[in-house]
Interface confidence: low
Amino acid sequence: MGRGVRVLLLLSLLHCAGGSEGRKTWRRRGQQPPPPPRTEAAPAAGQPVESFPLDFTAVEGNMDSFMAQVKSLAQSLYPCSAQQLNEDLRLHLLLNTSVTCNDGSPAGYYLKESRGSRRWLLFLEGGWYCFNRENCDSRYDTMRRLMSSRDWPRTRTGTGILSSQPEENPYWWNANMVFIPYCSSDVWSGASSKSEKNEYAFMGALIIQEVVRELLGRGLSGAKVLLLAGSSAGGTGVLLNVDRVAEQLEKLGYPAIQVRGLADSGWFLDNKQYRHTDCVDTITCAPTEAIRRGIRYWNGVVPERCRRQFQEGEEWNCFFGYKVYPTLRCPVFVVQWLFDEAQLTVDNVHLTGQPVQEGLRLYIQNLGRELRHTLKDVPASFAPACLSHEIIIRSHWTDVQVKGTSLPRALHCWDRSLHDSHKASKTPLKGCPVHLVDSCPWPHCNPSCPTVRDQFTGQEMNVAQFLMHMGFDMQTVAQPQGLEPSELLGMLSNGS
């Protein structure tokens, strides 16, 4: 396999390339629909209640045929709309040009309205961060799109959870879709403007507030549900901002809008690095140190209730999901790969295809175990045992399953559990699970994980090839399952 496999998907490359697929491919399986829980206020009396997403529980058989019918129905009902199923989200730079990207250019958002829907999905883009003048200068040279709006395209195609195609997005295809590009490099936490002293503005938290303010004039004021979603740094941004958005809407006179969060690949651990390195750049700097420095540099803000739990100067704790989550008031659904590539990157784990030493194998397995532990009290969670990064705006986000349930279905169940008829009930809905965390102990032990490609040959690898390539000894992997290595290989090869 040439110089070996590099399955590590650096966020910087992922976002630099502009593609959301990176170097992963996704196996298409019989598509499975939507899901999720926690409690919220019922709509005000007299308000029309928008129907919930289709409940696919009864649809056992041919999902493709069912989806084709749904799409055909949707298309036949759509011609009266000027949008004509146009997938594009259109760029709107903020009218308040003082709320800016790092370089002082106005921040903005991409919007695709769905006039019949009272659901709004606001998605926060990810893409690492920078935390001092030196690495921000470097970022500006190499990833300007993540620091400036000057070269943003006029439109973007909505993919995954941002898609308006029911077969690609069985969860919320009919929602109003908003994509907020990440151009503040501050994990959506900053509140400082560009000045003589500050070469860069860091206004992530203010950008979210301003986008919400402007969307109120574009129909958000009539929303029933606002789902603040995000991937990677955007996922952490959700945890940092969801309560503030709810508070903002309350203060502006819209207390009936139910604000929820969906944090994808933003639930990081402040664990011990596999190999400690000095805080030289964004990738090698230990997350705690990077965030500690970043907060000061960005004038970063964290959720008030979390901040009060920590000493001054210790606000960095609130960037870590398992610490901030218990302080949040809004319901949040957490999506996290158990073996997240960004987590491994900051932990200085680089998988090159050389045989993995036992120490590293144990480290990786322990990471999955720790991650799983932090999710045990998160009622709404989806954590497959895969080595990957980000999922919700990938086109094939419907493919991965945990315990037989796909992410869109889990989100649908979550919606149902938050609906007013269940708000007093703490028991999960029958046949509609929302706490879905893989229990198998090693990367890609879940056969629905996205397929890995060899970085050098471009060839797909099945799970067995991948594990052997990573240096996992099949005997070690098979033993805890009570299987012979040959049996396990057969099962994995068949995708069972």
Epitope: S98, A191, S193, S195, L206, N299, V301, E304, E312
Partner: antibody, heavy 121, light 109 residues
Framework: EVKLVESGGGLVKPGGSLKLSCAAS????????MSWVRQTPEKRLEWVAT????????YYSDSVKGRFTISRNNARNTLYLQMSSLRSEDTALYYC??????????????WGQGTSVTVSS | QAVVTQESALTTSPGETVTLTCRSS?????????ANWVQEKPDHLFTGLIG???YRAPGVPARFSGSLIGDKAALTITGAQTEDEAIYFC?????????FGGGTKLTVL
Amino acid sequence: EVKLVESGGGLVKPGGSLKLSCAASGFVFSSHDMSWVRQTPEKRLEWVATISSGGSYNYYSDSVKGRFTISRNNARNTLYLQMSSLRSEDTALYYCARQGDRYDGYVMDYWGQGTSVTVSS
Amino acid sequence: QAVVTQESALTTSPGETVTLTCRSSTGAVTTSYYANWVQEKPDHLFTGLIGGTNYRAPGVPARFSGSLIGDKAALTITGAQTEDEAIYFCALWYNNHWVFGGGTKLTVL
């Protein structure tokens, strides 16, 4: 009721030193940033210094940097301003003010009644 | 050092709406300048009214509101009352220091 009471002002010669105190009551002192602000004889307000709630971070105006030191004793609910190398332009009424945090927009909501400092030979 | 400029004096009548503004020499005032508005009444009685551009301090009457108007911070008194006659100072935060404006003397006739 929130109360801030400054003390320690007086007449001092140029180059001299003075230590101002501000006794706080009626709120959780250790949860708030605190500032010193002065009002010049011409009635202009000038911000002097701010200290963070735990005392870890201090900010000073350029005009006093290196000469004044802001500090606090959270156990005693007291804010201090140690002034040295005083100049005639430091003559002013000195106020301590309570600040909200970022979520309150750093609002300087409560002010003391002021203590007078005169620097003159 | 940045300079913060306010109207030196304004006059209004009881029940009228009046707006005071606060300009920065460095350019447009944004929310991250955390514009503060402080009221001074006779006998050196200072009260903070507004922080963070539009956050009204507890106990401050609802007729006082803060906002951004164009490139300036603004304090609006909707339905001014005679007791609102005072000097109003604005302060802007420049990342590591506050700068106060010269104050606006508001007369309510």
